[in-house]
Interface confidence: low
Amino acid sequence: IIPVEEENPDFWNRQAAEALGAAKKLQPAQTAAKNLIIFLGDGMGVSTVTAARILKGQKKDKLGPETFLAMDRFPYVALSKTYSVDKHVPDSGATATAYLCGVKGNFQTIGLSAAARFNQCNTTRGNEVISVMNRAKKAGKSVGVVTTTRVQHASPAGAYAHTVNRNWYSDADVPASARQEGCQDIATQLISNMDIDVILGGGRKYMFPMGTPDPEYPDDYSQGGTRLDGKNLVQEWLAKHQGARYVWNRTELLQASLDPSVTHLMGLFEPGDMKYEIHRDSTLDPSLMEMTEAALLLLSRNPRGFFLFVEGGRIDHGHHESRAYRALTETIMFDDAIERAGQLTSEEDTLSLVTADHSHVFSFGGYPLRGSSIFGLAPGKARDRKAYTVLLYGNGPGYVLKDGARPDVTESESGSPEYRQQSAVPLDGETHAGEDVAVFARGPQAHLVHGVQEQTFIAHVMAFAACLEPYTACDLAPRAGTTD
């Protein structure tokens, strides 16, 4: 199945010459960015990007690796060092603090410097660090958070919250002692720390009092409100803004995004995390691409520009389950959202960054033939005379011993969306990995994204590009036609 044209050196020389020509034309823009978008693929290490690229191509009946993801088209790339102050291999809380606030913190803390200690409420005050989103809001821009996880989850929370424990989603999750010391749950901080114009994702149950039935699953008590303080945070949020709208299904989201009277939009489409793309009820829940489009429609009305955080948050969850099919289909939807955002914005005035918070112990190897399924088997057998998949995990729940041995695997088994790829070490949940992740950049000041950098550099590039604190004296020309 090797394409005949690829046997000819001219094919490669011509392709490389075209790429070189495009590279020679790259001119660093001297203008400031009116808009900032950061696309965060949670757990989207480089092996995930490569495997998703192949899957995206194969879904279009191509061989795979020659395909371009939307993120592949971004002209500038750097590597980001993801370690947290206390761990070689980080979590999504400490990393969110790095790329959104520009300061590294400790494992499982959010929006706090490393002077704060995990789970110790009394180390919160005085150690708060301010996100680029918060600074953008202070500069008069509209701001938004879009995610496929709970909106109170670690990554989006980095944009607005300060907490010593990323698991404090609602007040029911906060120990009484911490509540008495004044530590607030993340859901409360979502509506009270700053004015966020667009909030889209999951996480309904953390916003409503215990005993409140969920509108989508009214008979399932476990999906209902969790709050002990009796507060209806959605109603409190609605009461703050004259043009505020709350939606919980796709139809109402699409309507609200086109309604000129809506100035603030909160859409919470599941009680907890949103469903995986492969399980999504497309009549009730919007896709990440649709949420991104809705957010951009609202935010782009502001002549001063906007800041938007878009997270493909369940790439990470698929990997933790050792279900590569889920992780990779989530990555493709994430990439589709990047592509749609590119169609709705201009690289003349919008700095777009794509990165991951951390990687996973996910590998792609075994010399598979070009064009063979990304979920398929490596050629030949392993030393135990059994087949093995080209996708594997270093650790995780895919480790199984059957009569003291590794189970054999067939192509039909490994192609199942529910299949867990095997691992070397048995764990309930597969772990993050510590290698550097990619940062892709396009738009004003994207040329600053180069080399091997600390993850904190990302927040500083965004702040500088838009002349936000502490770079208000950035000395960048405003984009031609910018209005105030």
Partner: nanobody
Framework: QVQLVESGGGLVQAGGSLRLSCAVS????????IGWFRQAPGKEREFVAR????????RYDDSVKGRFTVSIEDAKNTAYLQMSSLKTEDTAVYYC???????????????WGQGTQVTVSS
């Protein structure tokens, strides 16, 4: 678009009870709250009761407090107004409405049902 259809009205003797239903279709949003209003012949429409979609806030007009109860059954997308100890002055066309709260404008009701007649005879 949200549609509301009332039912359950009729003729009842003073001191009796009636239960009005308001079926909501078009998947009423969670930030829409159900209000009940009534309009007696020759009078303006007046507020009777309201309940937030999640049941966290309920309010009654003083004239019906202790006699009327508003409830919402999410599973059926239906709101109810249980009326007991009815008086002749409760005679009116009863309407349900879906509304939202804003700090600037207070409660506003965007969607209305067609109304159901309640007649209380002595």
């Amino acid at each position: 678009q949200v549609q509301l259809v009332e039912s359950g009205g009729g003729l009842v003797q003073a001191g009796g009870s009636l239960r009005l239903s308001c079926a909501v279709s078009g998947r009423a949003l969670s930030d829409y709250n159900i209000g009940w209003f009534r309009q007696a012949p020759g009078k303006e429409r007046e507020f009777v009761a309201r309940k937030t979609w999640d049941g966290s806030s309920t309010r009654y007009d003083d004239s019906v407090k202790g006699r009327f109860t508003v409830s919402i059954e999410d599973a059926k997308n239906t709101a109810y107004l249980q009326m007991s100890s009815l008086k002749t002055e409760d005679t009116a066309v009863y309407y349900c409405a879906a509304g939202r709260y804003s700090r600037a404008r207070g409660w506003e009701y965007d969607y209305w049902g067609q109304g159901t007649q309640v007649t209380v005879s002595s």
